[in-house]
Amino acid sequence: EKSDLRTVAPASSLNVRFDSRTMNLSWDCQENTTFSKCFLTDKKNRVVEPRLSNNECSCTFREICLHEGVTFEVHVNTSQRGFQQKLLYPNSGREGTAAQNFSCFIYNADLMNCTWARGPTAPRDVQYFLYIRNSKRRREIRCPYYIQDSGTHVGCHLDNLSGLTSRNYFLVNGTSREIGIQFFDSLLDTKKIERFNPPSNVTVRCNTTHCLVRWKQPRTYQKLSYLDFQYQLDVHRKNTQPGTENLLINVSGDLENRYNFPSSEPRAKHSVKIRAADVRILNWSSWSEAIEFGSDDG
């Protein structure tokens, strides 16, 4: 990734270096070290201070974005003297060339699309590349299928999400023969970007006095269990006047998803459809296909 690393240091340098692939900041170990500290300051003056690695000459930043530019700083005391060094990590390249409007969503439980737009000042020959690293940083995923607009990559389709974890780091690099292109990076939670399918296996069974609706929770990319779901049922009487209120019923997820409601014979024609959401986010899925029950002459 193209980025100028500029060191601001006193005469005897710690030789601070940063590897953006591993997010590891390291420096030359000093003999008889009594104190070490590393941190970064971002453009909004927020400070992030990770734990030092066991050897105390490096530290790893877990959840940080770098595209706005950051300054790393290392403080080391030895029994003889103190060291201090700053490392500027700017997002080099022409302002406004980075990918923008970046977003991703997971759908159908195991597919993901990411899209972005070319930067407003990016040259015509700009090309963007997407890399994804999971929170454990054990592997990097390169985009396997790019979505293109006039030859420029403006999106990515992934059909294998096995390398992702619950939180992932997305990096869009850019190249051009004309000028330096800035990068864009983002941290995304899979639970916040997943769009659920509607519930499946929706059935309605009625007796003389009640109707019982049953359904199965949707298959999801996240490992969710039954308590993580909230459902909404839309029970709708057919052939009613326009503007008549639909009955929307909220139901918490259960091991056996069911909703029993009074409906006596003869019963008019009704339809029921169901949608699902994560109970904590309420990002509703689309509605399931409507199931009809009852009769026209009810």
Partner: antibody, heavy 120, light 110 residues
């Protein structure tokens, strides 16, 4: 109606092993995740282990590591917990439970418990 | 010694409202991880009462949960004799798998 039915009480000698079973009815085991929790007499609840989807494997509480093995027989919808090198402090009621949520771990439905007594 | 601290006992008269506290730290409740609550009637298995801090499973009423900072609490309204039981809070400890439970609170209905 989903139910978890555990095996009967056991009395074991120190150093021996015990294997507790947990049969699921009204659901298939492959659609569920089972965890195990124990409770010593007059004491609180202690998580032992179970399936972690993030790791995609069964994970164990550190203090039981190397002594406990959790397995599943999907053909009979039965989960098992085996604890070896038993000592008197392992005397407890052992519960299996169905995970209702993974984040954080929430146990939605519990078995009736199996009393394991370790005594010489 | 549990990382979640609960009062050993609380009591209340029938019809009253009682609350049970659960105090953690920045590495569990304050991390922030959601809290769940379990009821254990004498001689029976625990039963889930509250999950995701304040959600109730179907069939549970009169019980409500809340969370603020590094603490959570369980409130029981309209206390009844059958509420006499042990109550446990639970959450996750950062860096550890599984669940951590509070030490439990014995509720006595006077």
């Amino acid at each position: 109606q989903v139910q978890l039915v555990q095996s009967g009480a056991e009395v074991k000698k120190p150093g021996a092993s015990v294997k507790v079973s947990c049969k699921v009815s009204g659901y298939t085991l492959t659609e569920l995740s089972i965890h195990w929790v124990r409770q010593a007499p007059g004491k609180g609840l202690e998580w032992m282990g179970g399936f972690d989807p993030e790791e995609n494997e069964i994970v164990y509480a550190q203090r039981f590591q190397g002594r406990v093995t959790m397995t599943e027989d999907t053909s009979t919808d039965t989960a098992y917990m085996e604890l070896s090198s038993l000592r008197s402090e392992d005397t407890a009621v052992y519960y299996c439970a169905i995970v209702g949520s993974f984040s954080p771990l929430t146990l939605g439905l519990w078995g009736q418990g199996t009393m394991v007594t370790v005594s010489s | 010694q549990s990382v979640l601290t609960q009062p050993p006992s609380v009591s209340g008269a029938p019809g009253q409202r009682v609350t049970i506290s659960c105090t953690g730290s920045g590495s569990n409740i304050g991390a922030p991880y959601d809290v769940s609550w379990y009821q254990q009637l004498p001689g029976t298995a625990p039963k889930l009462l509250i999950y995701h801090n304040n959600k109730r499973p179907s069939g549970v009423d009169r019980f409500s949960g809340s969370k603020s900072g590094t603490s959570a609490s369980l409130a029981i309204t309209g206390l009844q004799a059958e509420d006499e039981a042990d109550y446990y809070c639970a959450t996750v400890e950062a860096g550890l798998s599984g669940s951590v439970f509070g030490g439990g609170t014995k509720l006595t209905v006077l």
